[in-house]
Every structure is written in structure tokens, then in C-alpha cells.
Amino acid sequence: DIIMRPSCAPGWFYHKSNCYGYFRKLRNWSDAELECQSYGNGAHLASILSLKEASTIAEYISGYQRSQPIWIGLHDPQKRQQWQWIDGAMYLYRSWSGKSMGGNKHCAEMSSNNNFLTWSSNECNKRQHFLCKYRP
């Protein structure tokens, strides 16, 4: 049998049943999430649920740049270090960098310091690039 791979929106890339869009525009975390949602299909800021997924995303982004952090869908809405994915995915895989997570930093970014394989917390009102994800 021929199994057709679902197609992603123009410019989005496909990996293991998901489509990803890397936006090289500056948005704060909440505006980035709203922009992701505006694409429908249940799109949100991206959850990253395995090392394989993280590696695929990191390789893709490194083709564009290697120094600008990127918002992902992990946040701490209660400001109690209780992190959760905005798309409702289980928070099992973790890839935090060794940086302190204190202060007013309740949104997560892919850090450029380790080729986008690790995360850092940052202030949610910071404007930076972002990564969206949906299941086609």
C-alpha cells in the first residue's frame, strides 16, 4: 500500500506527523502564541517532546541562524516553576540548560548557546523569533 505523507502549509516543514513553522519575526511570547493559533489546525507554539524532535528542529533552524533564541510553547503560567506545554502535551522530556530559572522568567526559549538543543527561561515580554507546530 502507498501511504501518503500529509502536506504542510507552504514553507512549513514536516517531521513525524507534525508541521513546524519557524517565524523570523519578533514577538513576545503571548503574541507569538496568538500568531501560531491564527493558522488554525490546532497550531500552537511548539512542544518538543523528545531528543529526536529537538535535534530535527535544531538542525533546521541552524540552517538559518545560530545566535537568536526562539520561543517555544513551554511556560509557567502560575509563576511557580510548574512548567507546561501550551498545546496540552505531557511535560516529560526536559532539556533545560544549566542557567538559573529564577527572576521574572516564565516562558521558555530554545537557546542558541547549545545549537538550539537546550532551553532557557526568559521574560515573556521579550520580543524574539518563534516556532509554531500543528498536526496536519
Epitope: 507552504p10 514553507g11 512549513w12 513553522g21 517565524f23 523570523r24 519575526k25 545566535s67 523569533h129
Partner: antibody, heavy 125, light 109 residues
Framework: EVQLLESGGGLVQPGGSLGLSCAAS????????MSWVRQAPGKGLEWVSA????????YYADSVKGRFTISRDNSKNTLYLQMNSLRAEDTAVYYC??????????????????WGRGTLVTVSS | FMLTQPHSVSESPGKTVTLSCTRS????????VQWYQQRPGSSPILVIF?????PSGVPDRFSGSIDSTSNSASLTISGLQSEDEGDYYC?????????FGGGTKLTVL
């Protein structure tokens, strides 16, 4: 007042070389990425090259890569474009331009809100 | 990829005109789009940056937008005036370079 003034244009034979300069004033030159954009007679705009504020990163259109070199001297507030192995299709008005940056990391990602008047380069035998 | 613009557009004074800029591949939404106006014999002028932002000094008759469905950007000019006549270029980014559209000649009848 922010100003950019290009110079160095002229007539050159195919295969020849020419150097353009762009004198900047009215802003902190070293803080801004700079671009060269050209326009062939009766044609549209074509981005040629860009350089970061420090001069450490440079970018080129495929059509000029390996032939043109962009550089800057921040002590003189001047941008340069050295053009070698010139071809007839390089004939154009060359504009120097700069502006804000939507993403400071990407030096080629700067919109161009200040333009010079341009200098005409004619490549012909 | 390419940015495709209609070669020419004509409209009467006082009317509203919308100029389009379609990206041939990749998403128009991923990178900022700028619009430049070039009057005959003059250097280009930035009229819209970062998709929909207007530089100071540009009238609010000029507005920019992005439509991911049609994969295109638009420049809308309302209350068209004779001084709006000229060429309009969209511009975005591709990897390490800037890309301009071919331009649209706007004629105010």
C-alpha cells in the same frame, strides 16, 4: 540630518574594476548595517550586498559573489563596494542604503529607510 | 523563491488601490515584508516596514498587510493622490540575502 552620498561611478570596460564609496553623516555609522542596492536602466531594484555595523559579517547576491567586495571604515563613516570583473549586466545606478533592523542578529535583515541619491556605473566597450 | 508583483495598476484620484506581492515558495508569513515607493527620477522611499508598520512621515493612507492563505503581502493606498504615482517594490528575505519584487507601476489617472 541623516545623509548618504555615493561616489565613484563612471564608465568602465567589461572585465574592468571600479570602486564605489558612500559617505554617511547624521547618525552613529558603526551602529548600523549597510546595504548596496542597484537599479539597471528601466528595471527594478536588486539587492547587491550588505555588511554588519562592525564589518565582521558580509552578504552578497549570487550575481556578484566572488566579484564584488563590500567593506566599511567606521573611523571615516564610509561604506565601500569594490567591483571587479565587471560585466555589461552590472550597468546600473548603485544606491547606498541603511535603516533600522527587525532582528539585530541578522545583518541582512534590515529595512532601508535612508537611501543615497545613487551613482551610475556603466560597463561598456 | 520570487516575489511577483503586477506590472502596472491604474486608479483615479480619491480611490483606494491595493498592490499585491506574492511569494512563489516558502511562507510569506515567516519573514518581514517591506514596501518602497520610487517616484520617477528619485531614490526609493520606505513606506511600510515589518509587514504593517509605517515610518514617521508616511501618511496613514498607506497600510500593509499579510495574507498567509494567498501567500501574499499587500500595500493599500486610500484617498489616492497624484503624488502617489510611481513604482512600488515589495521586499523580504531569503537566507542571507534580501529579495525585491519586480515592482508595480502605479498610475493615478
Amino acid at each position: 540630518e541623516v545623509q548618504l552620498l555615493e561616489s565613484g561611478g563612471g564608465l568602465v570596460q567589461p572585465g574592468g574594476s571600479l570602486g564605489l564609496s558612500c559617505a554617511a553623516s547624521g547618525f552613529t555609522f558603526s551602529s548600523y548595517a549597510m546595504s548596496w542596492v542597484r537599479q539597471a536602466p528601466g528595471k527594478g531594484l536588486e539587492w547587491v550586498s550588505a555588511i554588519s555595523g562592525s564589518g565582521g559579517s558580509t552578504y552578497y547576491a549570487d550575481s556578484v559573489k566572488g566579484r564584488f567586495t563590500i567593506s566599511r571604515d567606521n573611523s571615516k563613516n564610509t561604506l565601500y563596494l569594490q567591483m571587479n570583473s565587471l560585466r555589461a549586466e552590472d550597468t546600473a545606478v548603485y544606491y547606498c542604503a541603511t535603516g533600522g533592523s527587525g532582528s539585530p542578529v541578522y545583518y541582512y535583515y534590515h529595512y532601508l529607510d535612508v537611501w543615497g541619491r545613487g551613482t551610475l556605473v556603466t560597463v561598456s566597450s | 523563491f520570487m516575489l511577483t508583483q503586477p506590472h502596472s495598476v491604474s486608479e483615479s484620484p480619491g480611490k483606494t488601490v491595493t498592490l499585491s506581492c506574492t511569494r512563489s515558495s516558502g511562507s510569506i508569513s515567516f519573514d518581514y515584508v517591506q514596501w518602497y515607493q520610487q517616484r520617477p527620477g528619485s531614490s526609493p522611499i520606505l513606506v511600510i516596514f515589518e509587514d504593517d508598520q509605517r515610518p514617521s512621515g508616511v501618511p496613514d493612507r498607506f497600510s500593509g498587510s499579510i495574507d498567509s492563505t494567498s501567500n501574499s503581502a499587500s500595500l493599500t493606498i486610500s484617498g489616492l493622490q497624484s503624488e502617489d504615482e510611481g513604482d512600488y517594490y515589495c521586499q523580504t528575505y531569503d537566507d542571507n540575502r534580501q529579495v525585491f519584487g519586480g515592482g508595480t507601476k502605479l498610475t493615478v489617472l
